[in-house]
Interface confidence: low
């Protein structure tokens, strides 16, 4: 099939005191090969500080996956989710408040 760019969604949730978990979800993309990783100060975090979900079919002939990491509250502006798919790449910041999230479709 033709290339379908991912929808990228960054959310945050409370973790332990002083920490938050930030999750970056990529959905509705094809083909399934994708790079999704958290960066701090513009450089990818090491694998041992991130958790990845499997790349799974979402029932529409496309795929979905996620990556999460735990960070200190107040340090959000240092972190971005980096996505690379079919030769295109994009970076997505952490939203500023608990109830906000960012949705971006990339063409």
């Amino acid at each position: 099939g033709s290339t379908v760019p991912p929808m990228v969604n960054v959310t945050r949730s409370e973790a332990s005191e002083g920490n938050i978990t930030v999750t970056c979800r990529a959905s509705s993309f094809y083909p399934r090969n994708i790079i999704l990783t958290w960066r701090q100060d513009g450089v990818s975090l090491s694998h041992d500080t991130q958790q990845w979900g499997d790349v799974l079919p979402d029932g529409n002939g496309t795929y979905q996956t996620w990556v999460a990491t735990r960070i200190c509250r107040g340090e959000e502006q240092r972190f971005t989710c980096y996505m690379e798919h079919s030769g295109n790449h994009s970076t997505h910041p952490v939203p500023s408040g608990n109830s906000h999230h960012h949705h971006h479709h990339h063409h």
Epitope: Q40, D41, G42, V43, S46, T49, C72, E75, Q77, R78, T80, T91, P93
Partner: antibody, heavy 118, light 108 residues
Framework: EVQLVQSGAEVKKPGASVKVSCKAS????????IYWVRQAPGQGLEWIGY????????IYNQQFKDRVTITADTSTSTAYLELSSLRSEDTAVYYC???????????WGQGTLVTVSS | EIVLTQSPATLSLSPGERATLSCSAS???????LHWYQQKPGQAPRLLIY???NLASGIPARFSGSGSGTDFTLTISSLEPEDFAVYYC?????????FGQGTKVEIK
Amino acid sequence: EVQLVQSGAEVKKPGASVKVSCKASGYAFTSNNIYWVRQAPGQGLEWIGYIDPYIGRIIYNQQFKDRVTITADTSTSTAYLELSSLRSEDTAVYYCSRSGERSNFDYWGQGTLVTVSS
Amino acid sequence: EIVLTQSPATLSLSPGERATLSCSASSSISSNYLHWYQQKPGQAPRLLIYRTSNLASGIPARFSGSGSGTDFTLTISSLEPEDFAVYYCQQGGSLPLTFGQGTKVEIK
């Protein structure tokens, strides 16, 4: 080979502004942040701020926030530091540096001496 | 702000001797975020050790780093003439990014 080449020395009067450039080569400019650091004569290193050239995000050391502007031009792989309302204590060597693993400074420019004198 | 205090301010040693430089943080730092730099007169600093104990590219094995929490150490096992310089520690764990005030290693 990664290189950061900075603009030449500047002499400015108090109250003036200065803009220092840092041209990057040897790597994909948008894949790393550019940090700015200064070092007053005989003193230690002081982090000023950084820019993520890919999304244009800028983070400043609060100490410098009111007088510093950091920008980047991705078309020329060049980052800029502008410091306004200069005073004598701003006399220093200003360095640009590339972000490395875990927020270190892995490559440095040669430095730009800014002298503020009446 | 995390304050890094380096000691001693000056270390006077002879070539071939062992140098031990300390960096103490005002609050705990993950060892992943503590780095060391070397600076010679008239030159930019250069990355020496990253993530507490990893040698940067091209750095000789006589340099080593260790530590955790608030106390970190840079060791030069046997000083060469080119090692006489100023050494800075730096933390990247929280903003603002900060450096120690430096330790000067001079020829005795």
